[in-house]
Interface confidence: low
């Protein structure tokens, strides 16, 4: 499977909300021994590898803001620390996998990472993530709503395996 | 099978450091949470930090921050936890644990205990 | 932290014998609670996982339930190799936290 990062740049007004989005796309095994992990976090651009540094969002680390699931189960975050930082993170059975963030500030821009690690218990991992670009503007020159820019079709297919 | 086999028995001095080694076999390592909880004699258990070594960075009780360093070799399925500034009070078992799935920490696979002695 | 209290911190019972024993979380942690047996000189065994869930292989006799702040552990029909501590965990919120365990012992 691979994952694809829909729009690879969000820019924002300060104060806005925004849904920053991956999808996992092809085949998905939904056996009983296979698990899905999707988490996000921050990251910059690496020389070497983009998403390979691992930084918390809002203080929150990926523990935090992970989801676990078998195939293409919906599920969402309902911890309440992540409710408290403005952030929720949710699935559904499409294979889409969202991050939301509320109330923006200028601080909240970066590069964010979606991880996603399938798990054959007890066997094998095969891990791929998707990088994006928030952008969060204040003044004149910001827009009233969020804007994205989708990802160049070789951007969107961000693929590592383990 | 998953087995974590803990590294032997250690007497320490107060003010030093000890480092436990926590081997997994027979599963993947990178993806499941490694945790360190210990027991002192007669006493509960006391989880003090975990680490998924597909991440790396560890997470750790607020009682033991500053104290206590857990780190993952992938390479070598091996878990590490060090405690420094050791007193007395943390003569204990020190069990590694893994987690059931991925990265919750429900334990179903523990370590067979390394006892620690802090003495003058 | 999630404080959890467990009750009672010992009972004695007989081979046969339905037990019960309660964990209370400080605040509400849903159903992240884990149960767990230890014998003297050995490692934690889990029993239930997600307060209800029997992990793979413990007998049948074991259960739990709850949710929110309210938990129980049922030993339906206390065996002598039942006799140990038990103790209960949440795995909600970061630190982890154990109750301050149940020793079993016989009548």
């Known amino acids: 499977f691979k994952v694809a990062t829909p729009y690879s740049l969000y820019v924002c007004p300060e104060g806005q909300n925004v849904t920053l989005t991956c999808r996992l796309l092809g085949p998905v095994d939904k056996g009983h021994d296979v698990t899905f992990y999707k988490t996000w976090y921050r990251s910059s651009r690496g020389e070497v590898q983009t998403c390979s540094e691992r930084r918390p969002i809002r203080n929150l680390t990926f523990q935090d803001l992970h989801l676990h699931h078998g195939g293409h189960q919906a599920a969402n975050t309902s911890h309440d620390l992540a409710q408290r930082h403005g952030l929720e993170s949710a699935s559904d059975h499409h294979g889409n996998f969202s991050i939301t963030m509320r109330n923006l500030t200028l601080l909240d821009s970066g590069l964010y990472c979606c991880l996603v690690v399938e798990i054959r218990h007890h066997h094998s991992e095969h891990r791929v993530h998707g990088a994006m670009e928030l952008q969060v503007q204040t003044g004149k020159d910001a827009p009233s709503n969020c804007v994205v820019y989708p990802s160049s079709s070789q951007d969107s297919e961000n693929i590592t395996a383990a | 099978q998953v087995q974590l086999v803990q590294s032997g028995a250690e007497v320490k001095k107060p003010g030093s450091s000890v480092k436990v080694s926590c081997k997994a076999s027979g599963g993947t390592f990178s993806s499941y949470a490694i945790s360190w909880v210990r027991q002192a004699p007669g006493q509960g258990l006391e989880w003090m930090g975990g680490?998924?070594?597909?991440?790396?960075?560890?997470n750790y009780a607020q009682k033991f921050q500053g104290r206590v360093t857990i780190t993952a070799d992938e390479s070598t399925s091996t878990a590490y936890m060090e405690l420094s500034s050791l007193r007395s009070e943390d003569t204990a078992v020190y069990y590694c644990?893994?987690?059931?799935?991925?990265?919750?920490?429900?334990?179903?696979?523990w370590g067979q205990g390394t006892l620690v002695t802090v003495s003058s | 932290d999630i404080q959890m209290t467990q009750s009672p911190s010992s009972l004695s019972a007989s081979v046969g014998d339905r037990v019960t024993i309660t964990c209370r979380a400080s605040?509400?942690?849903?159903?992240?609670l884990n149960w767990y047996q230890q014998k003297p000189g050995k490692a934690p065994k889990l029993l239930i996982y997600a307060a209800s869930s029997l992990q793979s292989g413990v007998p049948s006799r074991f259960s739990g339930s709850g949710s929110g702040t309210d938990f129980t552990l049922t030993i339906s029909s206390l065996q002598p190799e039942d006799f140990a501590t038990y103790y209960c965990q949440q795995n909600r919120g970061s630190p982890i936290t154990f109750g301050q365990g149940t020793k079993v012992e016989i009548k």
């Open positions: 644990a893994r987690s059931s799935y991925g990265w919750s920490y429900e334990f179903d696979y």
């Open positions: 605040q509400s942690i849903n159903t992240d």
């Open positions: 680490i998924i070594p597909i991440f790396g960075t560890a």
